[in-house]
């Protein structure tokens, strides 16, 4: 049994880091493998993660962490029984994938303006809380070419757009994702999408 693709890990910079790797053949990850991880800090204990299958030869493990500070570094040991398959380390602050925003809501009752709001996925005392920026994706269910991205570079989790920038009388969907420049993170996953029917009063044409 050998590791084909070494574990790569990302952290949500809060409580979970996710490590993925591939074995050289079909593996029952949860019965055959264990990923041990330990914070490099005084008196820190080693913890064991039981991996799950992620495709035939792929494994994934969710490492629980009580909290994260940017100096933290973890040692990682991948074991198959008594055999050490791989040894490495992981610094969560250098591999951050933020949590996805939640509670995306489209408010259509503001005179010909669409107000999209969502929730910051972090509590106020987390470092990322004040460092997230967002991308909002809006698309038409009827027209695949009607697909747009709005970059929200301010901290407030909201976006206002004129309803007239979208077509009237058809349904749209929106979703939002986040990233943090300070830690050069990857983008989060997209939030669940929300749907609304876009309608607004067309201005009278002058003849």
């Amino acid at each position: 049994m050998k590791v084909l693709q070494e574990p790569t890990c990302v952290s949500d910079y809060m409580s979970i880091s996710t490590c993925e790797w591939k074995m050289n053949g079909p593996t029952n990850c949860s019965t055959e493998l264990r990923l041990l991880y330990q914070l490099v800090f005084l008196l820190s204990e080693a913890h064991t993660c039981i991996p799950e299958n992620n495709g035939g030869a792929g494994c994934v493990c969710h490492l629980l962490m009580d909290d994260v500070v940017s100096a933290d570094n973890y040692t990682l040991d991948l074991w198959a029984g008594q055999q050490l398959l791989w040894k490495g380390s992981f610094k969560p602050s250098e591999h951050v994938k933020p949590r996805a925003p939640g509670n995306l809501t489209v408010h259509t009752n503001v005179s010909d303006t669409l107000l999209l709001t969502w929730s910051n996925p972090y509590p106020p005392d987390n470092y990322l809380y004040n460092h997230l920026t967002y991308a909002v994706n809006i698309w038409s269910e009827n027209d695949p070419a009607d697909f747009r991205i709005y970059n929200v570079t301010y901290l407030e989790p909201s976006l206002r757009i004129a309803a007239s920038t979208l077509k009237s009388g058809i349904s749209y969907r929106a979703r939002v994702r986040a990233w943090a420049q300070c830690y050069n993170t990857t983008w989060s996953e997209w939030s669940p999408s929300t749907k609304w029917h876009n309608s607004y009063r067309e201005p009278f044409e002058q003849h």
Epitope: V40, F41, L42, L43, D66, D67, V69, S70, A71, D72, N73, S93, D125
Partner: antibody, heavy 121, light 107 residues
Framework: EVQLVQSGAEVKKPGASVKVSCKAS????????MHWARQAPGQRLEWMGS????????SYNQKFKGRVTITVDKSASTAYMELSSLRSEDTAVYYC??????????????WGQGTLVTVSS | DIQMTQSPSSLSASVGDRVTITCRAS??????LIWYQQKPGKAPKLLVY???TLAEGVPSRFSGSGSGTDFTLTISSLQPEDFATYYC?????????FGGGTKVEIK
Amino acid sequence: EVQLVQSGAEVKKPGASVKVSCKASGYTFTSYNMHWARQAPGQRLEWMGSIYPGNGDTSYNQKFKGRVTITVDKSASTAYMELSSLRSEDTAVYYCARGGRLRRGDWFAYWGQGTLVTVSS
Amino acid sequence: DIQMTQSPSSLSASVGDRVTITCRASENIYSYLIWYQQKPGKAPKLLVYDAKTLAEGVPSRFSGSGSGTDFTLTISSLQPEDFATYYCQHHYGTPLTFGGGTKVEIK
């Protein structure tokens, strides 16, 4: 806005004790370590100890050999530092400072204004 | 206890100068290092934590680097308000200890 407000200056005789208070506001008092440090005139800062108000766990600098006691009153969001058997070299400005939610996150973004304790016969 | 040694203990510099202050730990503290700025009669102000993370509201002319035992605080272009004393502190276990300070004075 996080604020730490300390009690006023004290003048004490050698051998006496002093108790300095630090009232916290603007955050959840029980969720962060509270530390005490001091600075004698022209000297480096010196960490004295800390307490986690959530459960009362304390950690002390052994240099003070049981002379320092840190307590909290959770209902008043106030931390206290008592130093006993005072000597002239204990003359210093004493600071409270809010630490992190966990030990290795103990940097001090918020400090009290400082309390001058003078020990003189 | 982990000893923190700063150098120089003082330096003279002019506005616009690049200033570098070093801090050495007596043993490996990984990246668990903090920098503070202190002005006379005031409490210290947090500048950098975890060796290189800039605290909220700190100007980008300040930067921290290093890991293990050797650390550096750099001010890329000294401003009038930067004349102060700078302290390092480790937070790799207790007791927390501070460096002796570096006083940055006007040349």
